[in-house]
């Protein structure tokens, strides 16, 4: 069985302030089981943007229906983009673990740049 890959097809995305940004991510396998998370930035200081397991992320919607048992699309849309949202976003697959899930594989990242709102 081929090992799971995390595919973020776009290296960069440019969005006008006030619009929504779609960040694409797909998995090549459902195994190992475990949640998907999105982060802005890398390393210890990265910011959690979305956690499939839990939490309230009012500006984030998933593009696909994550409750489908065969879902491999973990793309997200972030609404009302501001310049503060600029950065590189990583789609990260975790495998289940106890007490904490273990980071398994990360996408290559998508850099979000924010254009000034058209006047």
């Amino acid at each position: 069985e081929d090992e799971l890959q995390v595919i973020q097809p776009e290296k960069s995305v440019s969005v006008a302030a006030g619009e929504s940004a779609t960040l694409r991510c797909a998995m090549t396998s459902l195994i190992p089981v475990g949640p998907i998370m999105w982060f802005r930035g890398a390393g210890a200081g990265r910011e959690l943007i979305y956690n499939q397991k839990e939490g309230h992320f009012p500006r984030v919607t998933t593009v696909s229906e994550l409750t489908k048992r065969n879902n491999l699309d973990f793309s997200i849309s972030i609404s009302n983009i501001t310049p503060a949202d600029a950065g590189t976003y990583y789609c990260v697959k975790f495998r289940k673990g106890s007490p904490d899930d273990v980071e398994f594989k990360s996408g290559a990242g998508t850099e979000l740049s924010v254009r000034a709102k058209p006047s």
């Epitope: 459902l30 195994i31 089981v33 949640p35 229906e65 994550l66 409750t67 048992r69 289940k96 106890s98």
Partner: antibody
């Protein structure tokens, strides 16, 4: 509080049909996948079918495929199980259950009894 | 198929462990469901291997390792007498399965 109320059970003859309902309250029904699980008298739990939050994807155990249909109406906060060609082996208490993000169950209905007898 | 013992017994205050085997660790999540009488609604005491719902007492805990899951009740009480079913979701087959149930008797 999360509440799931099963209904629609009763006594039917072999070969007949029945439609079970599950009324949900206390949570955003349209955000959760749901399942039906049954328990025959003196037996264990048996998962029958699951449905995604939007209702587009359904999943069944082999023994009920083609006979049972799971569906939902998110505008009515309701889950359904249409059961056709019933046999005595379908006699059981039927529970609806809310799924967790990874398709286990966190809340259960009270159950509704289906008896198939001639 | 999930395999669990048919019965276990313990004195009040003792620690009880119920095991459930039969799933592949990397494709399976486990849950534990308490049923106090036949035909009554099950209550989820553990889901996602080790997650305890907020209304379940802290004496209930869960773990998974290799091809097995374990439900541990630390300081068992008389009111914990019930049948405990392990359940699993398999990410390869998209199917839920249950063990046959373990009857816990508190002496």
């Amino acid at each position: 509080d999360v509440q799931l109320v099963d209904s629609g059970g009763g006594v039917v003859r072999p070969g007949e049909s029945l439609r079970l309902s599950c009324a949900a309250s206390g949570f955003t029904f349209s955000s959760y996948a749901m399942s039906w699980v049954r328990q025959a008298p003196g037996k264990g739990l048996e998962w029958l079918a699951g449905i995604s939050a939007g209702g587009s994807d359904t999943y069944y155990i082999d023994s009920v495929k083609g006979r049972f249909t799971i569906s939902r109406d998110n505008s009515k906060n309701s889950l359904y199980l249409q059961m056709n060609s019933l046999t005595a082996e379908d006699t059981a208490v039927y529970y609806c259950a809310r799924e967790t993000w990874n398709h286990l169950f966190d809340y259960w209905g009270l159950g509704t009894l289906v008896t198939v007898s001639s | 198929a999930l395999t669990q013992p048919a019965s276990v017994s313990a004195n009040p205050g003792e620690t009880v462990k119920i095991t459930c085997s039969g799933g592949d660790y990397y494709s399976t999540y486990y849950g534990w469901y308490q049923q106090k009488s036949p035909g009554s609604a099950p209550v989820t005491v553990i889901h996602s291997d080790d997650k305890r719902p907020s209304d379940i007492p802290s004496r209930f805990s869960g773990s998974a390792s290799g091809s097995a899951a374990t439900l541990t009740i630390t300081g068992v009480r008389v009111e914990d007498e019930a049948v405990y079913f392990c359940g699993a979701y398999d990410g390869r087959t998209y199917i839920n399965t249950f063990g046959a149930g373990t009857t816990l008797t508190v002496l």
